[in-house]
């Protein structure tokens, strides 16, 4: 199993062959310190890779690394924009699996 903050990018039937950092960081609210702005507090999504959940170090999952060249996950152009904060909480989903 990949570490938290990682995702399996290549997998066999029952195991992960290659873990990569999960490429989408969850947006969080960031507020200005109280002494900087009392009324004009702003809320911004953090830059990519700044959260513990988005470890930028490649190939550091617990699963064995693949010997083949790795395919990097690329960020679309939308990612550079300031993004709205999602209002819905993460949803844990269950599956019967295979």
């Amino acid at each position: 199993e990949c570490r938290p903050g990682m995702i399996c990018a290549t997998s066999a039937t029952n195991s992960c062959a290659r873990c990569v950092p999960y490429p989408i960081c969850a947006a969080e609210t960031v507020t200005k310190p109280q002494d900087m702005a009392e009324k004009d507090t702003t809320f911004e999504a953090p830059p990519l890779g700044t959260q513990p959940d988005c470890n930028p170090t490649p190939e550091n999952g617990e699963a064995p690394a693949s010997t083949s060249p790795t395919q990097s996950l690329l960020v679309d152009s939308q990612a550079s924009k300031t993004l709205p904060i999602p209002t819905s909480a993460p949803v844990a989903l269950s599956s019967t699996g295979k």
């Epitope: 199993e1 990949c2 570490r3 938290p4 990682m6 995702i7 399996c8 997998s11 066999a12 039937t13 029952n14 195991s15 992960c16 873990c19 999960y22 989408i24 969850a26 947006a27 959940d53 699963a63 679309d76 939308q78 990612a79 993004l83 709205p84 904060i85 999602p86 819905s88 909480a89 993460p90 949803v91 844990a92 989903l93 599956s95 019967t96 699996g97 295979k98």
Partner: nanobody, 122 residues
Amino acid sequence: EVQLVESGGGSVQAGGSLRLSCTASRFTFDGPDMAWYRQAPGNACELVSIISADGRTYYTDSVKGRFTISRDNAKNTVFLYLNSLQPEDTAVYYCAPDPRRNCRGGYCCGNWGPGTQVTVSS
């Protein structure tokens, strides 16, 4: 139990296009990220693309600039537009819900739906 139904696959010539759809039921669709994975015969299951709840999109480099992922939360559907298809894109395509949670453990192809076959001939 989460249920997903993938559709839109088919057989096309190289350079052709397809639109894949993944319709979800039994969970709140606008919450989690959604991902597309694919698996060619005899090959591993590989991550293709992810779309976040707020619309940010990510692609593996082999499909960057050719594939586009989008979602319609009102219709509980996520789409994958496949353009400039190549024979190496031939695979069964699967969508996966909330990959941040569900695809850490490994195999993420076919756990939630039957997939849809894409065949690209040269």
